[in-house]
Interface confidence: medium
């Protein structure tokens, strides 16, 4: 049994890091493998993660962490029984994938303005809470070409756009994702999308 693709890990910088790897053949990850991880810090103890299958030869493990700070470094040992298959390390702050924003809501009752709001996925005491910026994706269900991205570079989890920038009488969907420049993170997953019917009063055309 050998590792074909070495484990790569990303952290949500809160409580979970996810590691994925591939074996050289079909593997029952949960029965055959164990990923041991240990914070390199003052008497920290080793913890065991039981991997799950992620495709035939792929495995994924969700490492639970009490909290994360930028200096944290973990040793990782991948075992098959008594055989050490791979040894490495992982610094969560250098491989951050933020949690996805939640509770995306479209408020259509403001005159000819769409207000989109969502929730910051981190509690106020987490470092990322004040460092997230967002991308909002809006698209038409009827027209695949009507697809746009709005970058929200301020901290407030909201976006205002004029309803008239979208077509009237059409259903739209929106979703939002987050990233943090301070840790050069990857983008989060997209939030669940929300749907609304766009309608606004067309101004009278002047001839």
């Amino acid at each position: 049994m050998k590792v074909l693709q070495e484990p790569t890990c990303v952290s949500d910088y809160m409580s979970i890091s996810t590691c994925e790897w591939k074996m050289n053949g079909p593997t029952n990850c949960s029965t055959e493998l164990r990923l041991l991880y240990q914070l390199v810090f003052l008497l920290s103890e080793a913890h065991t993660c039981i991997p799950e299958n992620n495709g035939g030869a792929g495995c994924v493990c969700h490492l639970l962490m009490d909290d994360v700070v930028s200096a944290d470094n973990y040793t990782l040992d991948l075992w098959a029984g008594q055989q050490l298959l791979w040894k490495g390390s992982f610094k969560p702050s250098e491989h951050v994938k933020p949690r996805a924003p939640g509770n995306l809501t479209v408020h259509t009752n403001v005159s000819d303005t769409l207000l989109l709001t969502w929730s910051n996925p981190y509690p106020p005491d987490n470092y990322l809470y004040n460092h997230l910026t967002y991308a909002v994706n809006i698209w038409s269900e009827n027209d695949p070409a009507d697809f746009r991205i709005y970058n929200v570079t301020y901290l407030e989890p909201s976006l205002r756009i004029a309803a008239s920038t979208l077509k009237s009488g059409i259903s739209y969907r929106a979703r939002v994702r987050a990233w943090a420049q301070c840790y050069n993170t990857t983008w989060s997953e997209w939030s669940p999308s929300t749907k609304w019917h766009n309608s606004y009063r067309e101004p009278f055309e002047q001839h």
């Epitope: 008497l43 920290s44 103890e45 009490d66 909290d67």
Partner: antibody, heavy 121, light 107 residues
Framework: EVQLLESGGGLLQPGGSLRLSCAAS????????MSWVRQAPGRGLEWVSA????????SYADSVKGRFTSSRDNSKNTLYLQMNSLRAEDTAVYYC??????????????WGRGTLVTVSS | EIVLTQSPATLSLSPGERATLSCRAS??????LAWYQQKPGQAPRLLIY???NRATGIPARFSGSGSGTDFTLTISSLEPEDFGVYYC?????????FGGGTKVEIK
Amino acid sequence: EVQLLESGGGLLQPGGSLRLSCAASGITFSTYAMSWVRQAPGRGLEWVSAISGSGDSTSYADSVKGRFTSSRDNSKNTLYLQMNSLRAEDTAVYYCAKVIAARPHWNFDLWGRGTLVTVSS
Amino acid sequence: EIVLTQSPATLSLSPGERATLSCRASQSVSRYLAWYQQKPGQAPRLLIYDASNRATGIPARFSGSGSGTDFTLTISSLEPEDFGVYYCQQRSDWPLTFGGGTKVEIK
């Protein structure tokens, strides 16, 4: 009730031995690393020793290394400090303290009331 | 070992006044610094950990700041029960060390 209760302190002569105990209640004891911290009369706090949740790993202040041994019995929810070759400068109130999170996170959010150890001839 | 130096040694203030306590480390401790309060005959009580995080049940008038080598504990408006000795503690490296303490007394 969540608490730590030390016992075993007393008066003894230099060179003597003593074992302190710290009984924990209301917490999942084995989850948490623990420490002993002491305070000489009228003085500040001095960290003495630390032990991991499983008891596998320990660390000691230089002033007690080789003389004091920290251990724990997770089945009894009890922490111990075996003190040998005691000196006058070991006279202090000894506190056991629990780390704030299972990480371990070496700040202490739960302390016992302390037990007084007096070493004097 | 990392030496923590607290200043001033004694702070004489009246209830309602603002208290500012300092703790300086001999080398960087990142943000791994905590503050404790101790009253006579009692065990210490954790106030702040990791420089600025208030421990459970600690009133908002207590706040911590700083990183690296210089840290501050601020009590925005002293209450009668806030008088006592305050210690800083680092968890950046062995041995764990405490500062010598700052006594906050009633003026």
